[in-house]
Amino acid sequence: QDPWAAEPRAACGPSSCYALFPRRRTFLEAWRACRELGGDLATPRTPEEAQRVDSLVGAGPASRLLWIGLQRQARQCQLQRPLRGFTWTTGDQDTAFTNWAQPASGGPCPAQRCVALEASGEHRWLEGSCTLAVDGYLCQFGFEGACPALQDEAGQAGPAVYTTPFHLVSTEFEWLPFGSVAAVQCQAGRGASLLCVKQPEGGVGWSRAGPLCLGTGCSPDNGGCEHECVEEVDGHVSCRCTEGFRLAADGRSCEDPCAQAPCEQQCEPGGPQGYSCHCRLGFRPAEDDPHRCVDTDECQIAGVCQQMCVNYVGGFECYCSEGHELEADGISCSPAGAMGAQASQDLGDELLDDGEDEEDEDEAWKAFNGGWTEMPGILWMEPTQPPDFALAYRPSFPEDREPQIPYPEPTWPPPLSAPRVPYHSSVLSVTRPVVVSATHPTLPSAHQPPVIPATHPALSRDHQIPVIAANYPDLPSAYQPGILSVSHSAQPPAHQPPMISTKYPELFPAHQSPMFPDTRVAGTQTTTHLPGIPPNHAPLVTTLGAQLPPQAPDALVLRTQATQLPIIPTAQPSLTTTSRSPVSPAHQISVPAATQPAALPTLLPSQSPTNQTSPISPTHPHSKAPQIPREDGPSPKLALWLPSPAPTAAPTALGEAGLAEHSQRDDRWL
């Protein structure tokens, strides 16, 4: 396959993927494009990683170049070092591999330079102008685990189609990163959709075990029949429908005569008309039209309540006179103090809920605003054992205090940079600056992957702990795969996880909602279980967006209510500001703003190291900073950034003259 075909392609291993995007971009545009997908420009630091890049790029044309994640500031030559003064876009210079096209030449390095990889031959590294739009770019995506590609089965209609969290759709994967979806089409009819998920026993795996397509008989998936499957003599299947239903034109599904019936409330197939109408409890058929239902006034029934009765549409409620309490049966009254707790029964809510159709459920989800609902036990997973969405790196903080962000020491150059963290080869993203996301997840739309924020109970400030994720920092939350966020709201009953509506029969029992708990609630104390974090890591609050294939059968539909986390992001180096804000002190978190959406930049006065009036407190004097592309003004100033609603706004910076001199195209570091 020609890698220079119009479509991107990827090669994945058990812990990372490389993806080739044949799109003409400048270095800065390529860097942004990778970040928006949750990755970074490729950083092939080892011969093994380079080999994977080589196999992905293949034997391309000599005339084609691909950006990788190496850049160098002007006059930053260090020719004796392996990377010659270049820095990975993840912020460090660690490498066990280089592939320079030429030996280092002792020049003055007057200009900023970026590195592109030759598409041909040995894929040598060439340096050049960062503003050149080369032929494409290589992204790298790190994750905690991957699922092996599915084995082809005899009954499959074609190879499985995989969709990765970074939006690549292909049949050509050996490994699928956590959060990927596999769509399998069977010869015998309907196919299956599988999700690469975290397994309860540890590791990741497909959400459903094979075989997915058993053959042409009735055994796999009922032969594709909605109701009854009959195996014919020749081995093929024919479908039949149960009484009251008729076979649809596709020969597999069954049509419900009730679908078009004029019943106001409940319809049952059968009868002379093909259906009959019924009314819910609390209603009765209207005398003039049996299709309609009218409210039953239960209060007219003698003895329905011991004392007082209030009727309402679809139900009634019993009340007791002053000095009496309603008993547990919701009918009887007893003198006050005779029983422990007042109970009331709402037939409208408890007795009459007969499970509405999916359209009603959808509407209910649109109206859901973080409320909690008692649910029967869900077979998919115990609520107290959450399906861990593979946070590659989750810092831990004491429960009784807010997480601290590292600050630079006063004399620390350069003036615009963020704390650097150590490189971990298995998880690329931990070397990026970690940032509290300022983007708000929104409800899924046709162009936006769904977001699953978990809305958790309101807690005392002592117990408010953000859930930290570092898989895919610094990008709009709608693009982030496989991570759950937590914001705290109304207190639910203990062990009550947020509900996520789903239509995904391959994964969950019908009409049941999978649970995604990520905290354990006991009384008013929430304990979030997180592994340790080195002191120079800053927290990142983020959200999940699982990208699903538009064409996948039985596609997973995740519905959620948007949540909002107010923050006060600041420019690098991190500042604690004294400006007033609608945010309570417990939520005031100073963060590096290198990748925050730019909005309303406010210049702060320059601080000399010896005369600082702004409350900058150096807590990590030896922190280092990742190199993030920035626009390199003559003497950059610190800026206070406010969040912007634009989710993919690129990082921007201010030079000496503020915005007025900001050039239209600039490849200097942001």
Partner: antibody, heavy 124, light 108 residues
Framework: QVQLVQSGPEVKKPGASVKLSCKAS????????IHWMRQAPGQRLEWMGY????????TYNQKFKGRVTITLDTSASTAYMELNSLRSEDTAVYYC?????????????????WGQGTLVTVSS | DIQLTQSPKFMSTSVGDKVTITCRAS??????VAWYQQKPGKAPKLLIY???NRYTGVPSRFSGSGSGTEFTLTISSLQPEDFANYFC??????????FGQGTKLEIK
């Protein structure tokens, strides 16, 4: 050594078409992109479009779109540029040039070799 | 389009002189600038690429500098064969090349 040899001068009437050739030698033809430029008398050079012999990928200057077509005969290591609906202001020297890929470890998109140019005169 | 303005348009100089030609871009082009020499009736020759890198075989008296919007070509000591037309080219928004109008070096 690398050479780009262009076809001879052309005189055309307004409304006619002209097809110029650029024969490459001394290097692997499919490894380098070929660009076409022109220079009208007393004017600066003007970029018209390019073709990548590796995959026949072409891009044209919007100013000429619809009038210019760049093609290849890979077996003959030759690039062609055809300009239709000629008008008097198309009178110019037309150049083909090879875009460099890398020099001494640097990638760059400057033109390292040029053809000698072809004068096209459009006159009624 | 990005406009390139060269100055001067004409220059009368003598052998041994130091010559500086400037090229201004209408917007930031980074270092994606090349300089060419063209003699009458001949094809242009590449002198400097990426603003400051001397092309293979070009004499050391030719040098380039600058980045962003301002670029210079310097000939440290003019030789008889250097009398020609010189023009700059930007390619930051490749493939949309644009060129300077040229500077003609004449013998005084």
């Amino acid at each position: 050594q690398v050479q780009l040899v262009q076809s001879g001068p052309e005189v055309k009437k307004p409304g006619a078409s002209v097809k110029l050739s650029c024969k490459a030698s001394g290097y692997t033809f499919t490894d380098y992109v070929i660009h076409w430029m022109r220079q009208a008398p007393g004017q600066r050079l003007e970029w018209m479009g390019y073709i990548n012999p590796y995959d026949d990928d072409t891009t044209y200057n919007q100013k000429f779109k619809g009038r210019v077509t760049i093609t290849l005969d890979t077996s003959a290591s030759t690039a062609y540029m055809e300009l239709n609906s000629l008008r008097s202001e198309d009178t110019a020297v037309y150049y083909c040039a090879r875009r460099g890929n890398s020099y001494d470890g640097y990638f760059d998109y400057s033109m390292d070799y040029w053809g000698q140019g072809t004068l096209v005169t459009v006159s009624s | 389009d990005i406009q390139l303005t060269q100055s001067p348009k004409f220059m009368s100089t003598s052998v041994g002189d130091k010559v500086t030609i400037t090229c201004r871009a209408s917007q930031n082009v980074g270092t994606a600038v090349a300089w060419y020499q063209q003699k009458p009736g001949k094809a242009p020759k590449l002198l400097i690429y990426s603003a400051s890198n001397r092309y293979t075989g070009v004499p050391s008296r030719f040098s380039g500098s600058g980045s962003g919007t301002e670029f210079t070509l310097t000939i440290s000591s003019l030789q008889p064969e250097d009398f020609a037309n010189y023009f700059c080219q930007q390619y930051t928004n490749y493939p949309m090349y644009t060129f300077g109008q040229g500077t003609k070096l004449e013998i005084k």
